[in-house]
């Protein structure tokens, strides 16, 4: 007979998830309403398209990007969707409570949904480091803690450092990466004998992971421009992101070949490195004045990504127990940092040019923002990791890591693997 959830989890998961969903429905009932103002319908549709792009990125892009494991592809895609659906609901409420609750009700607009989808994307980036080692009940905890931590981080940053939605959301890369890595660090690491094959990639799942990468590649300009307030800024952000990801694809494929003794191209390198440029230009995508600069950044980001994919997995596998193909965590941690550093460099160049002490002060503020994002990510990640280690969640046994059969019903399989 195929393996099942342990009986206790079978009781715990539906109860936990459905109770939470009921609580969310009640919160929506008492505290939210739609923005009922008269609006131009054509404008509304255009605005919705950005949200749609973000949802495609999250559900298909990140869902499939994490599906390259030989025996964990179903769970990767479906668990991602589950987390996205839950994360968006909680993020809408949280953001409303933090930013507009004094007025009595949270007004839900298309922008709220856009913002919430981006917050939920943070969880989907982080979870790459732990997928296969946790069950759905644990993932619910991770969603709630991470969305709450990110929402509070954004609110603190906007109030203390006076940043707009775009700037404080662009910390998502660094935040999500360090959050995921710190959660992974807390989870049981060594893979027992006989399970090594499960965290290997297979051809068909790798193809679906490439499909995920393609969807992310296509829609990354929408992600980087989604929260900018003026058409001029959005247009610039779209162009620069497009140039950066275009160059990072070329760099990823050629750099991957260069990094291999026989000149072969690694699927794993390519999956992540094609996105490198988009992450690296994220923070300053609207500030870069010309294509060549965005292209240079895409090139640098692609090289860093390939280099990281070559040398970091060994370290990550030993220290954090992250499998070789789960490279989003360290990839985003490096590239997110690169993006933040690029923005700080732009401010430093301003200081040099203007000799203005106030610009120097802005550099310090930006470093403060970045440090705060990393600290909160690490602290909330460690807290989540400790929570996930509690016996109450009935985590999968190490021997059942990266195994779809633990979670899914496969009628055609009479016996376990």
């Amino acid at each position: 007979m195929s393996s099942k959830y342990p009986r206790s989890v079978r009781r715990c998961l539906p109860l936990w998830a459905l109770t939470l969903e009921a609580a969310l429905i009640l919160l929506f009932y008492f505290f939210t309403h739609y923005d009922a103002s008269l609006e131009d319908q054509k404008g509304l549709v255009a605005s919705y398209q950005v949200g749609q792009d973000l949802t495609v990125m999250a559900a298909i892009g990140l869902g499939f990007l994490t599906s390259s494991f030989r025996r964990h592809s179903w769970s990767s895609v479906a668990f991602n969707l589950f987390m996205l659906a839950l994360g968006v609901q909680w993020a809408i409420l949280l953001d409303g409570f933090l930013s507009q609750f004094p007025s009595g009700k949270v007004v839900i607009t298309l922008f709220s949904i856009r913002l919430a989808t981006m917050s939920a994307l943070s969880v989907l980036i982080s979870v790459d480091a732990v997928l296969g080692k946790v069950n759905l009940a644990q993932l619910v905890v991770m969603v709630l803690v991470e969305v709450t931590a990110l929402g509070n981080l954004r609110m603190v940053i906007s109030n203390i450092f006076n940043t707009d939605y775009h700037m404080n959301m662009m910390h998502i890369y660094v935040f999500a990466a360090y959050f995921g890595l710190s959660v992974a660090w807390c989870l049981p690491k060594p893979l027992p004998e006989g399970t090594e094959d499960k965290d290997q990639t297979a051809t068909i799942p790798s193809l679906s992971a490439m499909l995920g990468a393609l969807f992310l590649w296509m829609f990354w300009p929408s992600f980087n421009s989604a929260l900018l307030r003026s058409p001029i800024e959005r247009k610039n952000a779209v162009f620069n992101t497009y140039y950066a990801v275009a160059v990072s694809v070329v760099t990823a494929i050629s750099g991957s070949s260069l990094a291999h003794p026989q000149g072969k191209i690694s699927k794993t390198y390519v999956h992540s490195a094609v996105l490198a440029g988009g992450v690296a230009v994220g923070t300053s995508c609207h500030l870069i004045p010309s294509p060549w600069l965005a292209m240079v950044l895409g090139l640098v980001a692609g090289l860093i990504s390939v280099g990281g994919a070559k040398y970091l997995p060994g370290c990550c596998n030993r220290v954090l127990g992250i499998p070789h193909s789960s490279i989003m965590g360290y990839n985003f941690s490096l590239l997110g940092l690169l993006g933040e550093i690029i923005y700080i460099v732009l401010l430093v160049l301003d200081t040099v040019g203007a000799g203005n002490g106030m610009i120097g002060f802005q550099v310090l503020l930006s470093i403060g923002e970045l440090s705060l994002a990393i600290v909160i990510a690490l602290m909330s990640g460690l807290l989540t990791g400790l929570l996930l280690n509690l016996k109450i969640w009935k985590a999968p046994h190490e021997a059942k890591y990266f195994d779809d059969q633990v979670f899914w019903k496969f009628p055609h399989l009479a016996v376990g693997f």
Partner: antibody, heavy 129, light 111 residues
């Protein structure tokens, strides 16, 4: 000629509602964020609300949050302010203003400038019993 | 919520130079606050003079200039003319949740 013309003001009793309109002409309305600003008699300017160019995002001053709603119809080049549960302290001249975003560039970065560069002449709202 | 503070009133002689300042309760004002300056004469709508710290609009007279001084936004009027007598408002752009705050205004008197 770039122009904003407010209308809909008048005398209203406390607790009642009023809807202000602002008709825009002479510029591409759909690419500009729009603000409402008010000025009570003998007082300074007070920012009331802003709506992004595509209507996707709105912000309000704490003093009007939950009572006022800003909206726009880009097909009609018109900005609105729906004012509910009016109070005596809402008595003011209400101006609509266009937010202009311009930029300059150095070799390595763009600098954006936000400013309310076009204002209407204002419409007076008096809340009195 | 942030509070933006200006001098309530200043007096200057014709031909003189005067500097109006604009401070934020949240700390030092930087270019990221996009300081704006407006001039308002009695019975008229406000007229923008400066955007983004120091950028003049096409109609702004050359004697008006914007800058950052000691953690505040500043508007300097050199060679003051009698027609410069008005109330001057500064505006700062914040992040979220309240993105725009006006100062209380400075009444400039030209004697």
């Amino acid at each position: 000629e770039v122009q904003l013309v407010e209308s809909g003001g008048g005398v209203v009793q406390p607790g009642r509602s009023l809807r202000l309109s602002c008709a825009a002409s002479g510029f591409t309305f759909r690419t500009s964020a729009m603000h409402w600003v008010r000025q009570a008699p003998g007082k300074g300017l007070e920012w009331v609300a802003v709506i992004w160019y595509d209507g996707s995002n709105k912000y309000y001053a704490d003093s009007v949050k939950g009572r006022f709603t800003i909206s726009r119809d880009n097909s009609k080049n018109t900005l609105y302010l729906q004012m509910n549960s009016l109070r005596a302290e809402d008595t003011a001249v209400y101006y609509c203003a266009r937010e202009m975003v311009s930029y300059s560039s150095s070799w390595y970065r763009r600098y954006y400038y936000y400013n309310m560069d076009v204002w209407g002449k204002g419409t007076t709202v008096t809340v009195s019993s | 919520q942030a509070v933006v503070t200006q001098e309530p009133s200043l007096t200057v002689s014709p031909g003189g130079t005067v500097t109006l300042t604009c401070a934020s309760s949240t700390g030092s004002v930087t270019s990221g606050y996009y300081p704006n300056w407006f001039q308002q004469k009695p019975g008229q709508a406000p007229r923008p003079l400066i955007s983004g710290t120091s950028n003049k609009l096409s109609w702004t007279p050359a004697r008006f200039s914007g800058s950052l001084l000691g953690g505040k936004a500043a508007l300097t009027v050199s060679g003051v003319q009698p027609e410069d007598e008005a109330v001057y408002y500064c505006l700062l752009y914040y992040g979220v949740p309240q993105p725009v705050v006006f100062g209380g205004g400075t009444k400039l008197t030209v004697l």
